[in-house]
Interface confidence: medium
């Protein structure tokens, strides 16, 4: 079976790399536009130049192309805590990231939010905070991990996952409760 190609891919594959097939005349291969530019007019004939124009402010193309319009620059989402790492240029989109001591949490493929790295209070750092992952903490004795924070075993209820880690403390609490009732 031959894999299905879209019309544009089909047309491009007939021409050598760096060229595309003229949309009105499939015997002509036009040179693609450089990154930072877009297609204003197709080449008039073989060996003639494609009319490429530079992207306007607020738009870009990051690779050679035959797009009729440049792509709009992304905006960093301030309400997600994002900051601009580098501004948009004609040949590169805006790069957004997080502040120091924060990590990216991806809600979906194209949406991330910046969160503060856990400090591992009442515990130790098992794995340092990374660009896309929070610190991994190991808790001291008498504490258990809940939502990546070390919480005192006094907050451990019997129904929670913490019961194994906090078993001695729970039994002590149970013992004091039992001794007060007759």
């Amino acid at each position: 079976l031959v894999p299905h190609l879209g019309d544009r891919e089909k047309r491009d594959s007939v021409c050598p790399q760096g060229k595309y097939i003229h949309p009105q005349n499939n015997s002509i291969c036009c040179t693609k536009c450089h990154k930072g530019t877009y297609l204003y007019n197709d080449c008039p004939g073989p060996g003639q130049d494609t009319d490429c124009r530079e992207c306007e402010s607020g738009s870009f193309t990051a690779s050679e192309n035959h797009l009729r319009h440049c792509l709009s620059c992304s905006k960093c989402r301030k309400e997600m805590g994002q900051v601009e790492i580098s501004s948009c240029t004609v040949d590169r989109d805006t790069v957004c990231g997080c502040r120091k001591n924060q990590y990216r949490h991806y809600w979906s493929e194209n949406l991330f939010q910046c969160f503060n790295c856990s400090l591992c209070l009442n515990g130790t750092v098992h794995l340092s905070c990374q660009e896309k992952q929070n610190t991994v903490c190991t808790c001291h004795a008498g504490f258990f991990l809940r939502e990546n924070e070390c919480v005192s075993c006094s907050n451990c209820k019997k129904s929670l996952e913490c019961t194994k880690l906090c078993l001695p403390q729970i039994e002590n609490v149970k013992g004091t409760e039992d001794s007060g009732t007759t």
Epitope: E79, M80, G81, Q102, H105, Q113, C114, F115, N116, E147
Partner: nanobody
Framework: EVQLLESGGGLVQPGGSLRLSCAAS????????MHWVRQAPGKGLEWVSA????????YYADSVKGRFTISRDNSKNTLYLQMNSLRAEDTAVYYC??????????????WGQGTLVTVSS
Amino acid sequence: EVQLLESGGGLVQPGGSLRLSCAASGFTFGNVDMHWVRQAPGKGLEWVSAISSAGGETYYADSVKGRFTISRDNSKNTLYLQMNSLRAEDTAVYYCAKRMLANSPLAFDYWGQGTLVTVSS
């Protein structure tokens, strides 16, 4: 006082549709991103979808992409979630929430009380 009030939940058969609404008051609704989050019985919270303040940008968890559509009407201070092709695994309490906090994922400054969606034949 900030209030978020969800409605529209109920019992629906697999493959069916529901439209959830979230009526907001007590803050400038058109200035903030809004989210839908859900909690299935006996499970943790799961982020479902988000929409930008003006409604131009929408985001979806992979588990609902192509089936759910988030929208908002800023003139009515209302957030919506259109749920199509519902599956048993979509059974959960659905919450609308505003403004995520920076301390941890799924930490919001305000939540609604939730509306239960049950998908069962």
